[in-house]
């Protein structure tokens, strides 16, 4: 899908807009809010009833090169006694983010935007019961 | 920036790091993944730490619509459907990259922006405060 025009109307293109070749767009990868910090509750991945681990994926041809993925530790959820309760399910919560992919074609380099699905953490859910006819 | 492996046959002038500004194809790879979390799963209703999804829309951003989760309760829902306050519902937050139109309103000029979104909620045991 192409990036949509601003809103749903055709805005007047401001005079200050840079010239861009057809079929492409200019992207500044100096990140706005680069230094903001996540203020998530302390070590929730361990305190959760659906705990998870983190793994870092690394790809030098991707920007950002490092993407952190969560994996649920259990199929069930952890009960008050610290035991796994398989009557409940730990499930992944996912979120899309954008990355820039660098592609080499011979000696020329091109850049492509890519949507990546990141598993952020896990939550404990009641299972769906399928009734057999 | 980040270093990339260099093709030995290419001229040496190539920068090892990502340049500050790049020209990218207007088509986005993997664009068909579902962006509406309400349609992709009903975890937000079935979770012991259920959440509501709030639509955040900004035409100067791509994607223009982002769904923000807000935990419905401070406690967690137990097997009887009651709220347990000896457990807490907390948001799971994630930094994501989006495109911000720069300069504003320009159709094909963007800058990457990092934003913090609450994706869902999880049920946690409360923090133990040790009194000195």
């Amino acid at each position: 899908r192409k990036i949509p025009k601003v809103g749903h109307t055709f805005f007047q293109k401001p005079e200050s807009c840079p010239p861009v070749p057809g079929g492409s767009m200019k992207l500044d990868i100096g990140i706005i809010n680069e230094n903001q910090r996540v203020s998530m509750s302390r070590n929730i991945e361990s305190r959760s009833t659906s705990p998870w681990n983190y793994t870092v994926t690394w790809d030098p041809n991707r920007y950002p090169s490092e993407v952190v993925q969560a994996q649920c530790r259990n199929l069930g959820c952890i009960n008050a006694q610290g035991k796994e309760d398989i009557s409940m399910n730990s499930v992944p919560i996912q979120q899309e983010t954008l990355v820039v992919r660098r592609k080499h074609q011979g000696c020329s380099v091109s850049f492509q935007l890519e949507k990546v699905l990141v598993t952020v953490g896990c939550t404990c859910v009641t299972p769906v019961i399928h009734h057999v006819q | 920036g980040i270093t990339i492996p260099r093709n030995p046959g290419c001229p040496n002038s190539e920068d090892k790091n990502f340049p500050r500004t790049v020209m990218v194809n207007l088509n986005i790879h993997n664009r068909n993944t579902n962006t509406n979390p309400k349609r992709s799963s009903d975890y937000y209703n079935r979770s012991t730490s259920p959440w509501n999804l709030h639509r955040n829309e900004d035409p100067e951003r791509y994607p223009s619509v982002i769904w923000e989760a807000k935990c419905r309760h401070l406690g967690c829902i137990n097997a009887d459907g009651n709220v347990d306050y000896h457990m807490n519902s907390v948001p799971i937050q994630q930094e994501i990259l989006v495109l911000r139109r720069e300069p504003p309103h320009c159709p094909n000029s963007f800058r990457l922006e990092k934003i913090l979104v609450s994706v869902g909620c999880t049920c946690v045991t409360p923090i133990v405060h040790h009194v000195a």
């Epitope: - | 509501n52 807000k70 419905r72 309760h73 406690g75 709220v83 306050y85 000896h86």
Partner: antibody, heavy 118, light 113 residues
Framework: EVQLVQSGAEVKKPGATVKISCKAS????????MHWVQQAPGHGLEWMGV????????AYNQKFKGRVTITADTSTDTAYMELSSLRSEDTAVYYC???????????WGQGTLVTVSS | DIVMTQSPDSLAVSLGERATINCKSS????????????LAWYQQKPGQPPKLLVD???TRESGVPDRFSGSGSGTDFTLTISSLQAEDVAVYFC?????????FGPGTKVDIK
């Protein structure tokens, strides 16, 4: 200073509906929950239900059998409790009280007396 | 629902003497993960809303005189007024906030002998 100010006393006929407001100030309304408690003469304190204005979740006491509805307006930092199908035994003082993530209810409104009489 | 019981229903104590109120819950209010008991004690005077005195069984709220103390764990709890003052005449309630529906004890009326 945290304050919860409730609407004034009401006199209602059996079968009617009453809606009481509770205006919060002195704290971030969406960071806490609002609980409602009934105190009927000779019946002690009865928890009715709770709302989390920041997340929209509600929970109710089944003893009120679907007659109670709790809402919140985050634009005015006000919580509401509506009790329908009123009967004489609903004559009571109704309190709103702020709850935290541990369920601690530390600040209470001044109470609203509802009298149900034909 | 968790049932809360209190004893005695009422008691009369001389000024400066000790008053002890007991509260029992039908199930444990102890959260093993943080070792907290989700039990609160309230004081209510005529025409006023309840006032939180003690929470988590033994944590006194700020501004509450130190003659008030709470103790107990699991299902058995006690509120003690070490030296009764005239302004302590009131009804005292215990309440569990472990799970909904929150439930209160029937109250204990404290008077001066």
């Amino acid at each position: 200073e945290v304050q919860l100010v409730q609407s004034g006393a009401e006199v209602k006929k059996p079968g009617a509906t009453v809606k009481i407001s509770c205006k919060a100030s002195g704290y971030t309304f969406t960071d806490y929950e609002m609980h409602w408690v009934q105190q009927a003469p000779g019946h002690g304190l009865e928890w009715m239900g709770v709302i989390h204005p920041g997340g929209g979740g509600t929970a109710y006491n089944q003893k009120f059998k679907g007659r109670v509805t709790i809402t919140a307006d985050t634009s005015t930092d006000t919580a509401y409790m509506e009790l329908s199908s009123l009967r004489s035994e609903d004559t009571a003082v109704y309190y709103c009280t702020r709850g935290d993530h541990d369920g601690r209810t530390d600040y209470w409104g001044q109470g609203t007396l509802v009298t149900v009489s034909s | 629902d968790i049932v809360m019981t209190q004893s005695p229903d009422s008691l009369a104590v001389s000024l400066g003497e000790r008053a002890t109120i007991n509260c029992k819950s039908s199930q444990s209010l102890l959260n093993r993960s943080n070792q907290k008991n989700y039990l609160a004690w309230y004081q209510q005077k005529p025409g006023q809303p309840p006032k939180l005195l003690v929470d988590f069984a033994s944590t006194r709220e700020s501004g509450v005189p130190d003659r008030f103390s709470g103790s107990g764990s699991g299902t058995d709890f006690t509120l003690t007024i070490s030296s009764l003052q005239a302004e302590d005449v009131a009804v005292y309630f215990c309440q569990q906030h472990y799970t909904t529906p929150f439930t209160f004890g029937p109250g204990t009326k404290v008077d001066i002998k």
